[in-house]
Interface confidence: medium
């Protein structure tokens, strides 16, 4: 599923991401835009043999199990394929664990490079939330 901007903002808000660990909803929508272009089925492979999955591009080295990443920790205790569902519950629950891990949203490279320090509220402007 490819979400619309406001559609995703509403879904993320329903799942309790607005101001989760101090990060406003705009941060999460911005991260999703630049991680996956709002596509729940996005997958991207990394040079270390891991793969990033889903709308927030969650990595198989640490957070989920795809059955083929050497030394996978699977800290979210889920199959990576669950992160590709049109239902973003699994991605959101895992993202909450990631953002609580100490580095906050810096865990997402795209957020660090494209969203951090910008007017992230623009990503939810005009949305009925």
């Amino acid at each position: 599923k490819v979400f619309g901007r406001c559609e995703l903002a509403a879904a993320m808000k329903r799942h309790g991401l607005d101001n989760y660990r101090g990060y406003s909803l705009g941060n999460w929508v911005c991260a999703a835009k630049f991680e996956s272009n709002f596509n729940t089925q996005a997958t991207n492979r990394n040079t270390d043999g891991s793969t990033d999955y889903g709308i927030l591009q969650i990595n198989s080295r640490w957070w989920c199990n795809d059955g083929r990443t050497p030394g996978s920790r699977n800290l979210c205790n889920i199959p990576c394929s669950a992160l590709l569902s049109s239902d973003i519950t699994a991605s959101v629950n895992c993202a909450k664990k990631i953002v609580s891990d100490g580095n906050g949203m810096n865990a997402w490279v795209a957020w660090r490079n494209r969203c951090k320090g910008t007017d992230v509220q623009a990503w939810i402007r005009g949305c009925r939330l």
Epitope: T43, R45, G49, D66, G67, R68, P70, P79, S81
Partner: antibody
């Protein structure tokens, strides 16, 4: 136990297309990547690419882009590989395997012969 | 692409001999190297994963070692059922690649 059952041998004419199937049992099909491997005598084993059935995400070896197309049907736990514009170079045994990084589980192989 | 070079191409041995098969990678692949045995008209069979971890049900005479670019599959006291082709495969990066194989044959 995990099993991958491939479709039977095919004899095709040059220029035609063929679709090979790989039915998986014994595990959660949508969760694991299915990989496709080509074997020709004297050419060893070549990785064609992979599909994640749960999402339809695919990756192809550059060498096989335009030649192979992967699909999967999660309702029947079956992955498919279509090979198009067949030539004699496509005559080979084609294997599906469960993608664990390594390949512990393989299909029995589908022999494709391309001949006029 | 990472190239895997296996040597020797053919190895002629007598049952009871111990042998070593080599697989060399064109660049470092850490321990992401796996070994397979294949007999005629059969699918490959996983022997060793991650350079040194024995796959389930594999006899203890098979062992693997190495890291980086140089890897070895050792067979301690070859048995007649061990004859066939042996391939290495890397999962360090895409595309996945295989070595050209070593044929283990009876002398």
């Amino acid at each position: 136990q995990v099993q991958l059952q491939e479709s039977g041998a095919e004899v095709m004419k040059p220029g035609a297309s063929v679709k090979i199937s790989c039915k998986a049992t014994g595990y959660t099909f949508s969760t694991y990547w299915i990989e496709w491997v080509k074997q020709r005598p004297g050419h060893g084993l070549e990785w064609i690419g992979e599909i994640l059935p749960g999402s339809g995400s695919t990756y192809y070896n550059e060498k096989f882009k335009g030649k192979a197309t992967f699909t999967a049907d999660t309702s029947s736990n079956t992955a498919y590989m279509q090979l198009s514009s067949l030539t004699s170079e496509d005559s080979a045994v084609y294997y599906c395997a469960r993608g664990d990084g390594w390949y512990c589980y393989w299909g029995q192989g589908t022999t494709l012969t391309v001949s006029s | 692409d990472i190239e895997l070079t296996q040597s020797p191409a053919t190895l002629s041995v007598t049952p009871g001999d111990s042998v070593s098969l080599s697989c060399r990678a064109s660049q470092s692949i850490s321990n992401n190297l796996h070994w397979y045995q294949q007999k005629p008209h059969e699918s490959p069979r996983l022997l060793i994963k991650y350079a040194s971890q024995s796959a389930s049900g594999i006899p203890s005479r098979f062992s693997g070692s190495g890291s980086g670019t140089d890897f070895t599959l050792s067979i301690n006291s070859v048995e007649t059922e061990d004859f066939g082709m042996y391939f290495c495969q890397q999962s360090n990066s895409w595309p996945r690649t295989f070595g050209g194989g070593t044929k283990l044959e009876i002398k």
